[in-house]
């Protein structure tokens, strides 16, 4: 089900990420270090439990979840959010909610790449990963 996402991925390009973070409400200082980070993303599946680990000089984070089941998450930028991740047309679609706000993070395969689309209101950031 999520097997196409399993593996270690490295960030190779990032577009519009600062504007996305601004729209999310991330402060200047946090945007500065988050924007400089080049994270590796490690995705694994154990039964119905999916784990996504992000490792960078900025922060290491890890989420473990079952599809369709809401969970608590502390994001790399230090938001405490309620998240839910579902599989939609082969993409992992995550919705984070906090402080009356909501953002969507879509992870999808595109050829040999993993593309992450982050959307907040009208602002979209696209971050592309390749296998490490």
């Amino acid at each position: 089900m999520c097997d196409a996402f399993v593996g270690t991925w490295k960030l190779v390009s990032s577009e519009n990420f600062d504007d996305y973070m601004k729209e999310v409400g991330v402060g200047f200082a946090t945007r500065k270090v988050a924007g400089m980070a080049k994270p590796n993303m490690i995705i694994s599946v154990n039964g119905d439990l999916v784990t996504i680990r992000s490792e960078s000089t900025f922060k290491n984070t890890e989420i473990s979840f079952k599809l369709g089941v809401e969970f608590d998450e502390i994001t790399a930028d230090d938001r405490k959010v309620k998240s839910i991740i579902t599989l939609d047309g082969g993409a992992l679609v995550q919705v984070q909610k906090w402080d009356g706000k909501s953002t969507t993070i879509k992870r999808k395969r595109d050829g040999d790449k993993l593309v992450v689309e982050c959307v907040m209101k009208g602002v979209t950031s696209t971050r592309v990963y390749e296998r490490a």
Epitope: G25, G27, F28, A29, K59, D78, R79, D99
Partner: antibody, heavy 119, light 108 residues
Framework: QVQLQQPGAELVKPGASVKLSCKAS????????ITWVKQRPGQGLEWIGD????????TNNEKFKSKATLTVDTSSSTAYMQLSSLTSEDSAVYYC????????????WGQGTTLTVSS | EVVLTQSPALMAASPGEKVTITCSVS???????LHWYQQKSETSPKPWIY???NLASGVPVRFSGSGSGTSYSLTISSMEAEDAATYYC?????????FGAGTKLELK
Amino acid sequence: QVQLQQPGAELVKPGASVKLSCKASGYTFTSNWITWVKQRPGQGLEWIGDIYPGSGSTTNNEKFKSKATLTVDTSSSTAYMQLSSLTSEDSAVYYCARLRGYYDYFDFWGQGTTLTVSS
Amino acid sequence: EVVLTQSPALMAASPGEKVTITCSVSSSISSSNLHWYQQKSETSPKPWIYGTSNLASGVPVRFSGSGSGTSYSLTISSMEAEDAATYYCQQWSHYPLTFGAGTKLELK
């Protein structure tokens, strides 16, 4: 519990330099920006600059760029601010504070170091 | 530079009175990045309200914060003696980080 420890006072002569310290404990030092703030007697708060201990990256107030140099020693979880070419205008209380991510507000403050520049 | 203008600069309130302090921002910022601090004489500032409306740990519920864009406020529903202090607003949405000049609140 999070603590930021600063010396209570420093007395230095005009023209000299001083290195103020801020020792952090109770959290992962490399994960939060440390900020320095100046407060002259009876005045408001003035931002000097930030340093991110995880990388050494700094963000400085242009006004203090030639006055203040920010560094960290991660082995001792201590942030430092060196102030150079001191004058009476530099006499003030200097606070260090921890920046909480996302919101970027100061969730913990040191007690402040009172710097007196006098001959 | 984003300028934060606090008003009033000085005010006095009687116990039980409602108090509102405003912070006007020279250009629009994210409400997540507007904060308030309380400072009493000879002590460090304390985080009081963060992200416009979130009360910091230990802050009495008589305090509240609101606003968006360029206009923000801190409100005390019923003034108490221990609320006498100077309050500063601060933003770190845009470079450089800036503080308001402060509002000194005295007990009448």
